[in-house]
């Protein structure tokens, strides 16, 4: 059965999965994608790593970990209702059958509402400003190709302003890991 | 064209093995999985396992672990399907599929399929 | 092993007819893990539908995919004399990948 995790509408979801790589640099693909694992690789993919690089991602989904030491825990930026479900982490170890996959049940509560004092509220409380690495046009989808001006430095330091870290390190210590090697 | 051309057909005693080749073309080798699915004579389709020709790893049917081996040459954009212990039961039409999965199209379904190599284990 | 059991067994129609083939699976399966396949006499079997509802290239509009969960349908809106063969559905979300045991569709 799936390991549950409980975030608020609003709010960053993070999913940990973590791997230890057999020697430093020598990365594994990861895949996540929506919904439970299937036979191979992930469907409805939302991130996946090669052996180098985060080479495709979809937006509001991020690794704000240092993935090159095997921490690939996916943060869910801004999350909605319709984020609930069953979410793929997969690493993709080479050889016969030895993907390892974990299957993370994300429940998205609502937000909880507090009764303004007054009639007139505060704006800001109500809509805090967002971090954003966006900016790039329409694209749903896009990969570290099309994002010449943001590298992934960038992208995990203004992801990280917006994980909450106390439950970062809360769910980092239940997070499913495995070691490579 | 997208093609995958298989090797002929086979007649093989019980408990030999036979190696069944299928050879890629008209696109990128490495950039999609490959199956092996069996038809016994008027039956249906059983999958048998898979091959990811880019790093050669595989995954195999429960049924056939151990005596299934999936390999691939990619010099020549080939991948392999061994059996080995044959027994009558074995004897089917064996087909390489093409899986739609690459980069950037996360979908699954085998969309390119060999012509099929007829496998006779009969002593 | 999730099994996939295809209804009917045969199905009996005319050209111009609407035919729709049911698949159950004996758990839940993503529809993103449901495909549909058809197969003629001698030949290999051609992708018709994946992620359940998608046609695959070259697939006339008159087939389509549905459902959800545990049942599934393709359906063919108006059959035309090519159309009679075996069709499967498959699942690609548990291991091993497994197909349905095939509706044969025929000339009534």
């Known amino acids: 059965s799936e390991v549950e995790y409980r975030a608020e509408v609003g709010q960053n979801a993070y999913l940990p999965c973590f791997y230890t790589p057999a020697a430093p640099g020598n990365l594994v693909p990861v895949c996540w994608g929506k919904g439970a694992c299937p036979v191979f690789e992930c469907g409805n993919v939302v991130l996946r790593t090669d052996e180098r690089d985060v080479n495709y991602w979809t937006s509001r989904y991020w690794l704000n970990g240092d993935f090159r030491k095997g921490d690939v825990s996916l943060t869910i930026e801004n999350v909605t209702l319709a984020d609930s479900g069953i979410y793929c982490c997969r690493i993709q170890i080479p050889g016969i059958m030895n993907d390892e996959k974990f299957n993370l049940k994300l429940v998205i509560k609502p937000a909880k509402v507090t009764p303004a004092p007054t009639r007139q509220r505060d704006f800001t409380a109500a809509f805090p400003r967002m971090l954003t690495t966006r900016g790039h046009g329409p694209a749903e989808t896009q990969t570290l190709g099309s994002l010449p001006d943001i590298n992934l430095t960038q992208i995990s330091t203004l992801a990280n302003e917006l994980r909450d870290s106390r439950l970062a390190n809360d769910l980092r210590d239940s997070g499913a890991t495995i070691r490579i090697g | 064209q997208v093609q995958l051309q298989q090797s002929g057909a086979e007649v093989k005693k019980p408990g030999a093995s036979v190696k069944v080749s299928c050879k890629a073309s008209g696109y990128t080798f490495t950039s999609y999985y490959m199956h092996w699915v069996r038809q016994a004579p008027g039956q249906g389709l059983e999958w048998m396992g898979i091959i990811n020709p880019s790093g050669g790893s595989t995954s195999y049917a429960q049924k056939f672990q151990g005596r299934v081996t999936m390999t691939r040459d990619t010099s020549t954009s080939t991948v392999y399907m061994e059996l080995s212990s044959l027994r009558s039961e074995d004897t089917a039409v064996y087909y390489c599929?093409?899986?739609?999965?690459?980069?950037?199209?996360?979908?699954?379904?085998?969309?390119?399929w060999g012509q099929g190599t007829t496998v006779t284990v009969s002593s | 092993e999730t099994t996939l059991t295809q209804s009917p067994g045969t199905l009996s129609l005319s050209p111009g007819e609407r035919a729709t083939l049911s698949c159950r699976a004996s758990?839940?399966?993503?529809?993103?893990?449901l495909a549909w396949y058809q197969q003629k006499i001698g030949q290999a079997p051609r992708l018709l539908i994946y992620g359940a509802s998608s046609r695959a290239t070259g697939i006339p509009d008159r087939f389509s995919g549905s459902g959800s969960g545990t049942d599934f349908t393709l359906t063919i809106s108006r059959l035309e004399p090519e159309d009679f063969a075996v069709y499967y559905c498959?699942?690609?979300?548990?291991?091993?990948?497994?197909f349905g045991q095939g509706t044969r569709l025929e000339i009534k």
């Open positions: 758990q839940s399966v993503s529809s993103s893990y």
């Open positions: 599929a093409r899986d739609l999965y690459s980069y950037g199209f996360y979908y699954y379904g085998m969309d390119v």
């Open positions: 498959q699942q690609y979300g548990s291991s091993p990948i497994t």
